[in-house]
């Protein structure tokens, strides 16, 4: 029994890392294989993961962590019964994937601008809290042409547009995703969209 | 807001045994080590002991055998069971949430130690 | 065990000066962890730097932290009437613990 390809792990900066890796053939992963990690630090444990297989050769882990900060540095070994297949370390803050933001809500009832708001997926103690930047993606259902994305690039988890930059009368829907310049983290998934139905009063047209 | 308030100070004489608590809040203190810092008066700081996520600790020499570290995550609590007191424990005992280095503490609360 | 040693003992200033306050350790130590800390009277300490240059959440940029090895500095630019106080470097070490400097008095002039 090989790894194939080395495991490659990315941290949320909150309480959870997934690693991923393959093994050079099919492999109940939870039976066969552990993942021992360990903060490089005098007050920390080792762990054990059992991992889940991702695909025939693949495995996957989720490894729970203590709140992240920059300078975590952790031991991974990957296990087969009594045989170390592979050593590594990772430092999470190297390897950010923000986690997806919630509660993503449409307000129509303001005069012809839609306010767009959702939560910040991070406590207020957590360093990324003050550092997330936001893409909001509204595409309208009827027309896959009509896809727009806008960049938040304030820290505020909103967005106001007029409404008539969309079409009246038709249903849109709407997502949106984080990221972390400072510790240039990859985009995180985008949270569930929400849907909600455009209209608008034209204005008055005089001839 | 993290917050940490510690109790439990109070006069003691040489000898004798004091149990210090600290109350946090604001933040998930399962995911986070724990620490105690003590500054005697008019002195500079010294860390005394700390805890791990997983219950492991360590002691400054001039604690060690002397002083328990523990917590209590169901109830967000840390503890301080200090035995064999000696003048020289007189100090402010503060809390403080950390890792590397400390980045909340509490106000701290005054242990004398004196016959 | 790691000595950290501050100079200098006091720092005597007036506001609008800057500040430089130096913490030499006995032996080399790592930048990730070196922190700082000021303390005011009757206060707690409060984080002002870590990983010897990164500012804690809204500390104002006035206070950098350079240096590494067994040097380290922490400046303040442009003293403000609230900046004067007690500052503490300190340091983590995998096998010895925590360990702090004695501290430097910043007063006024």
């Known amino acids: 029994m090989k790894v194939l390809q080395e495991p490659t792990c990315v941290s949320d900066y909150m309480s959870i890392s997934t690693c991923e890796w393959k093994m050079n053939g099919p492999t109940n992963c939870s039976t066969e294989l552990r993942l021992l990690y360990q903060l490089v630090f005098l007050l920390s444990e080792a762990h054990t993961c059992i991992p889940e297989n991702n695909g025939g050769a693949g495995c996957v882990c989720h490894l729970l962590m203590d709140d992240v900060v920059s300078a975590d540095n952790y031991t991974l070994d990957l296990w087969a019964g009594q045989q170390l297949l592979w050593k590594g370390s990772f430092k999470p803050s190297e390897h950010v994937k923000p986690r997806a933001p919630g509660n993503l809500t449409v307000h129509t009832n303001v005069s012809d601008t839609l306010l767009l708001t959702w939560s910040n997926p991070y406590p207020p103690d957590n360093y990324l809290y003050n550092h997330l930047t936001y893409a909001v993606n509204i595409w309208s259902e009827n027309d896959p042409a009509d896809f727009r994305i806008y960049n938040v690039t304030y820290l505020e988890p909103s967005l106001r547009i007029a409404a008539s930059t969309l079409k009246s009368g038709i249903s849109y829907r709407a997502r949106v995703r984080a990221w972390a310049q400072c510790y240039n983290t990859t985009w995180s998934e985008w949270s569930p969209s929400t849907k909600w139905h455009n209209s608008y009063r034209e204005p008055f047209e005089q001839h | 807001e993290v917050q940490l308030v510690e109790s439990g100070g109070g006069l003691v004489q040489p000898g004798g045994s004091l149990r210090l608590s600290c109350a946090a809040s604001?933040?998930?203190?399962?995911?986070?080590?724990m620490f105690w810092v003590r500054q005697a008066p008019g002195k500079g700081l010294e860390w005394v002991s700390g805890?791990?996520?997983?219950?492991?600790?360590s002691y400054a020499d001039s604690v060690k055998g002397r002083f328990t570290i523990s917590r209590d995550n169901a109830k967000n609590s840390l503890y301080l069971q200090m035995n064999s007191l000696r003048a020289e424990d007189t100090a402010v005992y503060y809390c403080?949430?950390?890792?590397?280095?400390?980045?909340?503490w509490g106000q701290g609360t005054l242990v004398t130690v004196s016959s | 065990e790691i000595v950290l040693t501050q100079s200098p003992g006091t720092l005597s200033l007036s506001p609008g000066e800057r500040a430089t306050l130096s913490c030499r350790a006995s032996?080399?130590?790592?930048?990730?962890?070196l922190a700082w800390y000021q303390q005011k009277p009757g206060q707690a300490p409060r984080l002002l730097i870590f990983?010897?240059?990164s500012r804690a959440p809204g500390i104002p940029d006035r206070f950098s932290g350079s240096g590494s090895g067994t040097d380290f500095t922490l400046t303040i630019s442009r003293l403000e009437p609230e900046d004067f106080a007690v500052y503490y470097c300190?340091?983590?070490?995998?096998?010895?613990?925590?360990?702090f400097g004695q501290g430097t008095k910043v007063e006024i002039k």
């Open positions: 403080a949430r950390g890792r590397y280095y400390f980045d909340y």
């Open positions: 604001g933040f998930t203190f399962s995911r986070n080590a």
């Open positions: 805890i791990g996520t997983g219950g492991a600790t």
């Open positions: 032996q080399s130590v790592s930048s990730s962890y």
């Open positions: 990983g010897a240059s």
């Open positions: 300190q340091q983590y070490d995998h096998s010895a613990g925590w360990t």
